[in-house]
């Protein structure tokens, strides 16, 4: 079954998140500075004519681009689009921003710059003060806080009104840790790296972030193909070669926002066995309630059956038995030369009275700081390989 039950559909995650309709209160909108109280952050709501008709920063955004408008969504959301406008001022406003950058945070401390699938950070904005320009964020960002940084190519006044569109991040997944995806060499190179991962990469390990395995995009039967335009072969999948893992498995760790009772994990896998991709032979998961705590009880083991000869990509459901945890560590056993995953999601319920790691207050310092990766993670033997692509210019597979 190729369906990802309990898995969010990014095409349906496009709701206005509350700037225009004021469900985001003024207290959750802030800014680095403003011209005056009449152009304060609270006046930055899309289609609003409050105050002098927009947020306008006091400082120049050229050349430093340090001024920002911040929206606190209070809970983690998947932000799939943003909309911008210039200053209204009863039709007299002339200020708008032709381009801008976005930064986002899940915890209020670590900020990531949004980039498109080809590594471009600058977003085209408005051409006039009144028109609304929507930007489809590919990839979308999982964020609680979003900052808009208006840009200009000379000293000039810029003003912004904004809206964010998306949906609540119900999965509760804060980050996953995994070995860096590898390159498969067929008649052409197939790049199976996690090209939108927003965490850290150290010594062949990615940790502290989210990426393509949690973006809602399910890969095709033929992992060389993608529905995305101008992307390299293998784009939708993250993959690992059996040759690089003497242990016979790939180990991943998942961190969640709060204690949850886990019913199942859904892993969308490729099974194009004529090209070496096979479903995992089995999955083994361990559970713990906190970062420094011991793994609890026996691991959950699940052997995979089904029609392994069927080349269709499919979602594999791994029962997790209602085990309660905030951290999961899962081992995916190789059953062939390659493991290729396009999406991992979880079916879980928040345990009542569990205090959130993210919510009204921010969590304690992250358990894996932006330094060396955890020492208790299985050592990886990664074969040398060429530079992995992060972006692709048209006509070039890796540029």
């Amino acid at each position: 079954d190729a369906d990802m039950k309990g898995h969010f559909d990014p095409a349906k995650c496009r709701y206005a998140l509350g700037m225009q309709d004021r469900t985001i209160p003024d207290s959750d909108i802030s800014a680095s500075s403003s011209w005056s109280d009449s152009t304060a952050a609270r006046h930055s709501r899309l289609e609003s004519s409050d105050g002098d008709g927009a947020w306008c920063p006091a400082g120049s955004v050229f050349p430093k681009e340090e001024e920002y408008l911040q929206v606190d969504l209070q809970r983690l959301h998947l932000v799939a689009l943003v909309g911008t406008q210039g200053r209204h001022a009863g039709g007299l406003g002339k200020e708008f921003s032709r381009s801008y950058r976005l930064r986002y945070s899940r915890d209020g401390r670590r900020w990531m710059g949004w980039k498109d699938r080809w590594g471009q950070e600058v977003i085209s904005g408005n051409e006039d003060p009144e028109g609304v320009v929507l930007k489809d964020l590919g990839p979308p960002m999982v964020a609680r806080l979003v900052r808009f940084y208006p840009r200009a190519d000379r000293v000039m006044s810029v003003c912004l009104r904004v809206e964010l569109y998306g949906c609540l991040w119900r999965d509760g997944l804060l980050s996953y840790t995994a070995p860096v995806g590898q390159t498969m060499y067929l008649s052409e190179a197939v790049y199976l790296n996690d090209s939108t991962y927003d965490g850290h990469t150290v010594g062949g390990l990615q940790y502290g972030g989210l990426g393509q395995l949690a973006d809602g995009v399910v890969g095709l039967d033929d992992f060389r193909k993608s529905q995305e335009l101008r992307v390299w072969p293998g784009y939708d999948y993250v993959g690992w070669s059996n040759h690089s893992f003497s242990s016979g498995y790939v180990e991943m760790e998942f961190e969640f926002d709060r204690l949850r009772a886990f019913q199942a994990m859904q892993v969308h896998c490729n099974n194009m066995h004529t090209l070496g991709a096979r479903l995992p032979g089995g999955v083994e998961c361990r559970f713990r309630r906190g970062p420094a705590m011991a793994w609890e009880g026996e691991p959950m083991r699940h052997n995979l059956g089904g029609n392994l000869g069927d080349p269709r990509a499919r979602a594999v459901s791994v029962p997790l038995g209602g085990r309660v945890a905030r951290f999961l560590q899962c081992r995916f056993l190789f059953a062939g030369p390659w493991l290729l995953f396009s999406e991992i999601s979880f079916i879980s319920d928040v345990v009542n009275n569990s205090s959130p790691a993210l919510g009204g207050t921010f969590p304690p310092a992250p358990w894996w700081p932006p330094g060396p990766p955890p020492t208790n993670f299985s050592s990886l033997e990664l074969e040398p390989r060429g530079q992995q692509p992060v972006a692709k210019a048209e006509g070039s597979p890796t540029a």
């Epitope: 190729a2 033929d222 529905q227 995305e228 335009l229 004529t274 000869g309 080349p311 990509a313």
Partner: antibody, heavy 116, light 110 residues
Framework: SVKESGGRLVTPGTPLTLTCTVS????????MSWVRQAPGKGLEWIGT?????GTWDATWARGRFTISRTSTTVDLKITSPTIGDTATYFC??????????????WGPGTLVTISS | ELVLTQTPASVSEPVGGTVTIKCQAS??????LSWYQQKPGQPPKLLIY???NLASGVPSRFKGSGSGTEFTLTISDLECADAATYYC????????????FGGGTEVVVK
């Protein structure tokens, strides 16, 4: 070249197997597909088989057709034909070995008539 | 379910004219689209692959364009030999698909 055979007049419910024979090319290097065309109608994809024997079929064709292959032939079995299965059946070679992509070589087709 | 919708169903143009055939996919298929020409009593013949690439031996009067969900086949300087039915075909996915072909467009050359 690619050539279909086995097309004939049969009564409804009588199983029928069509065979696609390839000459001059290495069949083991390509995915192969069956496509049909009812009189005066458009092209209708039935299914594809790749070099490992993995198959895909049209949603409407499931359970009604079986595709298999040997080192030299690709067969299409119509398990229980109905009058609506009357058509010219084409065998087509894909550009790729592993999945349907596009068809670079077609057979001339074989006519199947289902009539009581 | 991925569906290809071809328009128009039929078009008539004089010799030397230009015909434009559109193929719309119900979801994005990147550039995985091909075009075929079929004449009565013959199998289809590949014209264009990967949305815009001309197949071997096909005259440059045939031009494919588009990406995502909207694709176009343009035939310029029409000749009598171009009278045929033209089909688009998606090559991105064959899972849970009714048909990988569009419904076809008949081109009549006057």
């Amino acid at each position: 070249s690619v050539k279909e055979s086995g097309g004939r007049l049969v009564t409804p419910g009588t199983p029928l197997t069509l065979t696609c024979t390839v000459s001059g090319i290495d069949l083991s290097s390509y995915a192969m597909s069956w496509v049909r065309q009812a009189p005066g109608k458009g092209l209708e994809w039935i299914g594809t088989i790749n070099i490992g024997g993995g198959t895909w079929d049209a949603t409407w064709a499931r359970g009604r057709f079986t595709i298999s292959r040997t080192s030299t032939t690709v067969d299409l079995k119509i398990t229980s034909p109905t009058i609506g299965d009357t058509a010219t059946y084409f065998c087509a070679r894909d550009v790729d070995a592993h999945t349907l992509t596009y068809f670079t070589l077609w057979g001339p087709g074989t006519l199947v008539t289902i009539s009581s | 379910e991925l569906v290809l919708t071809q328009t128009p169903a039929s078009v008539s143009e004089p010799v030397g004219g230009t015909v434009t055939i559109k193929c719309q996919a119900s979801q994005t298929i990147s550039s995985w689209l091909s075009w075929y020409q079929q004449k009565p009593g013959q199998p289809p013949k590949l014209l264009i692959y990967y949305a815009f690439n001309l197949a071997s031996g096909v005259p440059s009067r045939f031009k494919g364009s588009g990406s995502g969900t909207e694709f176009t086949l343009t035939i310029s300087d029409l000749e009598c030999a171009d009278a045929a039915t033209y089909y688009c075909q998606q090559g991105i996915s064959s899972s849970n698909v009714d048909n990988v072909f569009g419904g076809g467009t008949e081109v009549v050359v006057k």
